[in-house]
Interface confidence: medium
């Protein structure tokens, strides 16, 4: 959460001299309340915009717009505090619009905009516009808040932003997962144009539950340049899990631009369809059946015979 670096922050408009200042998010009117305070903003509109930084990076920014109510309280409006709170970290960033001249009624409703809050993909923010001065302790609130969820890097508009491209958004692995038999899953995906390794996490779940009953990790070494953009396939050996039939395959790349934090792609294989007249279910459900002829201990990442190869 930061401000767009190079822009001169402007809030003046015809009929109003205004300057934008950094704010500590604690306006002086909290400490020294005023008797007469303006009413709250009428409407807040928030949408996503993409702007370029002085280094030429494309970054997602919040475009915040609000209007004033048409009441006499605008005579006491000295400015506004804009606050953006990132909900998962409680990080807050504020700026202050400081009006250097008195507002007067004119033929159009007063409207203000600000488009300099740089945000992160797939994060939720609370945007608050507080009219200044803030109300006395028991006074009517004169702010409005709205939540805004920034789309993730799958979103077409976000895909081309620098933070998304850095995390591998341009790679589309086009994963396919196929059940070969009760003990094998075949995973196919397209390699990216970088000599970096991949990790496949297989997580299995009972039919209607969300706690995992089995996990296995498979490592894929870095492909050679001639294998870039080619399909790679991996056969994973299951532990023949009984009642543990829904399999989620997640592929994690380790691109140089994002290392451990690259975007992961998933595909899921559902449990087989239940027959119309199901057999009576016992009052317990073992998670897997005996394996034949294998003495290799298979748990977590030790899945025995998983193997892979790349092909054109």
């Amino acid at each position: 959460l930061r401000l767009l670096d190079h822009r001169a922050l402007v809030c003046s408009q015809p009929g109003l001299n205004c300057t934008v200042k950094n704010s500590t998010c604690l306006d002086d009117s909290w400490i020294h309340p005023r008797n007469l305070t303006p009413s709250s903003p009428k409407n807040i509109y928030i949408n996503l915009s993409v702007s370029s930084t002085q280094h030429g990076e494309l970054v997602p920014v919040l475009h915040v717009e609000w209007t004033l109510q048409t009441d006499a309280s605008i005579l006491y409006l000295e400015g506004a505090e804009l606050s953006v709170l990132q909900l998962n970290t409680n990080e807050r960033l504020c700026v202050r619009f400081e009006f250097l001249s008195k507002l007067r009624h004119h033929h159009r409703r007063w409207r203000f905009t600000f488009s300099h809050f740089v945000v992160d993909p797939d994060q939720e923010y609370e945007v608050t516009v507080h009219h200044l001065p803030k109300p006395i302790p028991d006074g009517d609130p004169n702010h409005q808040s709205k939540n805004f969820l920034v789309p993730d890097c799958e979103h077409a508009r976000m895909k081309v932003t620098t933070p998304c491209m850095s995390s591998g958004s341009l790679w589309d692995p086009n994963i396919t997962v196929e059940t070969l038999d009760t003990q094998h899953l075949r995973v196919d995906f397209t390699l990216w144009n970088e000599s970096t390794h991949y990790q496949i996490l297989l997580t299995s779940f009972p039919h209607m539950e969300n706690h995992s009953c089995f996990e296995h990790m498979h490592h894929i070494p870095a492909p050679r340049p001639e294998e870039f953009h080619q399909r790679s396939n991996v056969t994973l050996t299951l532990r023949n899990l009984k009642g543990c039939c829904r399999h989620q395959v997640q592929i994690q790349p380790f691109f140089s631009s994002c290392l451990n934090d690259c975007l992961r792609h998933s595909a899921t294989v559902s449990c087989p369809e239940m027959p119309d007249t199901p057999e009576p279910i016992p009052d317990y459900m073992p998670l897997w059946e005996p394996r034949s002829g294998s003495s290799d201990y298979k748990d977590d990442d030790d899945k025995g015979s998983s193997h892979h190869h790349h092909h054109h």
């Epitope: 990790m217 897997w288 977590d300």
Partner: antibody, heavy 116, light 107 residues
Amino acid sequence: QVQLVQSGAEVKKPGASVKVSCKASGYTFTRYGISWVRQAPGQGLEWMGWISAYSGNTNYAQKLQGRVTMTTDTSTSTAYMELRSLRSDDTAVYYCARRQLYFDYWGQGTLVTVSS
Amino acid sequence: EIVMTQSPATLSVSPGERVTLSCRASQSVSSNLAWFQQKPGQAPRPLIYDASTRAAGIPARFSGSGSGTDFTLTISSLQSEDFAVYYCQQYDNWPLTFGGGTKVEIK
């Protein structure tokens, strides 16, 4: 060599919480799950639950559901087990162990005493 | 949950003797069974997994057998360092469960 090193003994009052740590070394932490097992004085072993060090997926024993939380910090290769609303019958040695199903390496154990 | 029952609770034997420990599951656990050895003040030590496979570094005198509901841990010739408590554990079904243990003590 693989090692799981647990935090030191704790004495807690009933109703309090305890958080036991388990620092792993000698292997790639995210490749294996961490399970927690406890043993009351003079008693047998009781499975408490498991956490995937890779995905954070968990599976808890039904009787501890709502009181136990297992977490990992991959940056320090450390697993944590927090038990809340402690009762006197939670007095036990708490072990972390590597893997999800069968436990091939164990921590040295952490004695948690719950007493008023 | 699957209940694991071990017998006997205590076994008094002399060094050099052959020892057979029993573990019974309340329902089939196929071959998803492990054996552990625990000495006082120490963490359990893995001996056997998948009912019959010895863990790394475990001497050949330890062997496991059985599948379904009945399992056996055999120590062919008991050494002085083998006096301990032995636990079986099933991992066929959640929750994972342990037997109550068999204490092998010096006669």
